[in-house]
């Protein structure tokens, strides 16, 4: 009778085991083991027992002990079960960003592992079990579907294998996949709102604002603002589920023409974009040209207004004839024209908008001097001892210097308050002098003596 010990063994893959083959007869003709495994017989006392070290056990095996005794030949098998944890436990790759409301399929693949009867695959969200199934097939595959919710944001999904050898007196061996961290998001179907000037003048700055509501998580939203090839650098302000991106845009002559202004919002693996056209224009103020900015009275003056070739101008409210970018007027300079403003207004249509620019020039007319009766009366009669202010205004451009002298020496205090005395009486010669020449006028002061009663 042949016996084997142990009759059942569970051992790690690649491990070794000692198997004892025994026979009930004292002097067996033959005692041995039949196995494809590498084996070593060990030293033992006696003849009816042999111990074999079986090594590098890679798969389940059934070594067979045999003995040949006088009463016949017999055999006994031992059952070697190899255990090993899976070589690969992997969640199928998924985009890390998933839109809320989408059905997400988690697929776990398990390669290897034995004994399969003791191997279970578990899909988890955090520590919560989503699905538990025995490992079947090679590779074993377990799938489950998850409806993506907002509160799943940042959740870790993983796959775990459990090789439960506790019934065999061993432990529970666990292998866990690398976690998949889910990033959930909501990007509304509405495009972002873009507020910007439709037209922008060269060498000026404009403000662009892009905003969008109903985002989750708003802090993860990327905003890209660009005008043509120029990336704008916005300042982004976040609300609970909204953002507003504000940027300054500067344009130069190189940008002139129609440019595309884009605002793109990227969240997760989706994007929403708004496009707008901005017309960059160059429109210098019109040019007002006077023949000479300073002329003498009676001189003929030409006033010209020139503007952008596509502009329409009016000069002092009078439209150009024909309507266009140039206008002019002719005048003979009079004193009344001194300080007169000539205003040119140019209007340019850019992308359906009317842009207005103005330029004003002032004409200086040199005239005089003049001394008129109205401004410098020839006769004054004042009571003696009364308070009076002699007035004499000389006119001209430049303003003339005025002196009124009696007998060439005694001055009349023009514009000053004086007490009228007998000395003030007489005829004064008022002389107004400027670069334009001089004029004189006689002024007589009469002093009335008080009546003595």
């Amino acid at each position: 009778q042949t016996s084997v010990s142990p009759s059942k063994v569970i051992l790690p893959r690649g491990g070794s085991v000692l198997v004892t083959c025994s026979t009930s007869c004292d002097q067996p003709k033959l005692l041995g083991i039949e196995t494809p495994l590498p084996k070593k017989e060990l030293l033992l006392p006696g003849n009816n027992r042999k111990v074999y070290e079986l090594s590098n056990v890679q798969e389940d095996s059934q070594p067979m002990c045999y003995s040949n005794c006088p009463d016949g030949q017999s055999t006994a098998k031992t059952f070697l079960t190899v255990y090993w944890t899976p070589e690969r436990v992997e969640l199928a790759p998924l985009p890390s960003w998933q839109p809320v409301g989408k059905n997400l399929t988690l697929r776990c693949q398990v390669e290897g592992g034995a004994p399969r009867a003791n191997l279970t695959v578990v899909l988890l969200r955090g520590e919560k079990e989503l699905k538990r199934e025995p490992a079947v097939g090679e590779p074993a595959e377990v799938t489950t579907t998850v409806l993506v919710r907002r509160d799943h944001h940042g959740a870790n999904f993983s796959c775990r294998t459990e090789l439960d050898l506790r019934p065999q007196g061993l432990e529970l061996f666990e292998n866990t996949s690398a976690p998949y961290q889910l990033q959930t998001f909501v990007l509304p179907a509405t495009p972002p709102q873009l507020v910007s000037p439709r037209v922008l003048e060269v060498d000026t700055q404009g403000t662009v604002v892009c905003s969008l509501d109903g985002l989750f998580p708003v802090s993860e939203a990327q905003v890209h603002l660009a005008l043509g090839d120029q990336r704008l650098n916005p300042t982004v302000t976040y609300g609970n589920d909204s953002f507003s991106a504000k940027a300054s845009v500067s344009v130069t002559a190189e940008d002139e023409g129609t440019q595309r202004l884009t605002c793109a919002v990227i969240l997760g693996n989706q994007s929403q974009e708004t496009l707008q056209t901005v017309t960059i224009y160059s429109f210098p103020a019109p040019n007002v040209i006077l023949t000479k900015p300073e002329v003498s009275e009676g001189t003929e003056v030409t006033v010209k207004c020139e503007a952008h070739p596509r502009a329409k101008v009016t000069l002092n409210g009078v439209p150009a004839q024909p309507l266009g970018p140039r206008a002019q007027l002719l005048l003979k300079a009079t004193p009344e024209d001194n300080g007169r403003s000539f205003s040119c207004s140019a209007t340019l249509e850019v992308a359906g908008q009317l842009i207005h620019k103005n330029q004003t020039r002032e004409l200086r007319v040199l005239y005089g001097p003049r001394l008129d009766e109205r401004d410098c009366p020839g006769n004054w009669t004042w009571p003696e001892n009364s308070q009076q202010t002699p007035m004499c205004q000389a006119w001209g451009n430049p303003l003339p210097e005025l002196k009124c002298l009696k007998d060439g020496t005694f001055p009349l205090p023009i514009g000053e308050s004086v007490t009228v005395t007998r000395d003030l009486e007489g005829t004064y010669l008022c002389r107004a002098r400027s670069t334009q020449g001089e004029v004189t006028r006689k002024v007589t002061v009469n002093v009335l003596s008080p009546r003595y009663e």
């Epitope: 017989e41 060990l42 030293l43 033992l44 006392p45 006696g46 003849n47 042999k50």
Partner: antibody
Framework: QVQLKESGPALVKPTQTLTLTCTFS??????????VGWIRQPPGKALEWLAL???????YYSTSLKTRLTISKDTSKNQVVLTMTNMDPVDTATYYC?????????????WGQGTLVTVSS | DIELTQPPSVSVAPGQTARISCSGD??????ASWYQQKPGQAPVLVIY???DRPSGIPERFSGSNSGNTATLTISGTQAEDEADYYC?????????FGGGTKLTVL
């Protein structure tokens, strides 16, 4: 460290019984798997294995000398004793005791210095 | 009983590789050990469990065992390796030594 030392008579008369003692230190014969054995070497000849006793008191003997040999142990004294009956001049040899760290694998990792036993009348 | 057969002598030039064989019926199914013995000294274990080297034994000593032959290999043999070498195995319930090989370093 592990040490073994053989002791016994240097001269034995033919037909007498030889008693050799192996005293060891640095290990215990009550440790699972451990054994102590005896080997002899006649002058100018090869090593010849004689006997072995293990921690479990299992005894192993050379088939050709089995009837003349007895091996025993005194675990408390850390000693192993070998007796060989009916000594003959051909039994003249250096007798060694050695430790088997894993008896079932049969190798001897530490040897005593040996004791020369001459059998002569 | 198993018998272990070794060549009586092997010669090798210093620095060369020496190989000493030990043959026995189905020897590869059992563990083999090797001992070095210098004149007047006790044997020293140099290889056990076919190919394992005890601590303190130089790396130039290596062993193998398969089929009916165990082999002790000394790579880059040195003058101090000149000695008698014994193989050892077992045939339950007894232990067996080979007849020994004298290694001469030329």
């Amino acid at each position: 460290q592990v040490q073994l030392k053989e002791s016994g008579p240097a001269l034995v008369k033919p037909t007498q019984t030889l008693t050799l003692t192996c005293t060891f230190s640095g290990f215990s014969l009550s440790t699972s798997g451990v054994g102590v054995g005896w080997i002899r070497q006649p002058p100018g000849k090869a090593l010849e294995w004689l006997a072995l006793i293990d921690w479990d008191d299992d005894k192993y003997y050379s088939t050709s000398l089995k009837t003349r040999l007895t091996i025993s142990k005194d675990t408390s004294k850390n000693q192993v004793v070998l007796t060989m009956t009916n000594m003959d001049p051909v039994d003249t040899a250096t007798y060694y005791c050695a430790r088997y760290p894993v008896t079932q694998r049969s190798y001897m990792d530490v040897w005593g210095q040996g004791t020369l036993v001459t059998v002569s009348s | 009983d198993i018998e272990l057969t070794q060549p009586p002598s092997v010669s090798v030039a210093p620095g060369q590789t020496a190989r000493i064989s030990c043959s026995g019926d189905a020897l590869g199914d059992k563990y083999a050990s090797w001992y070095q013995q210098k004149p007047g000294q006790a044997p020293v274990l140099v290889i056990y469990d076919d190919s394992d080297r005890p601590s303190g034994i130089p790396e130039r000593f290596s062993g193998s065992n398969s089929g009916n032959t165990a082999t002790l290999t000394i790579s880059g043999t040195q003058a101090e390796d000149e000695a008698d070498y014994y193989c050892q195995s077992y045939d339950s319930p007894q232990v067996v030594f080979g007849g020994g090989t004298k290694l001469t370093v030329l």
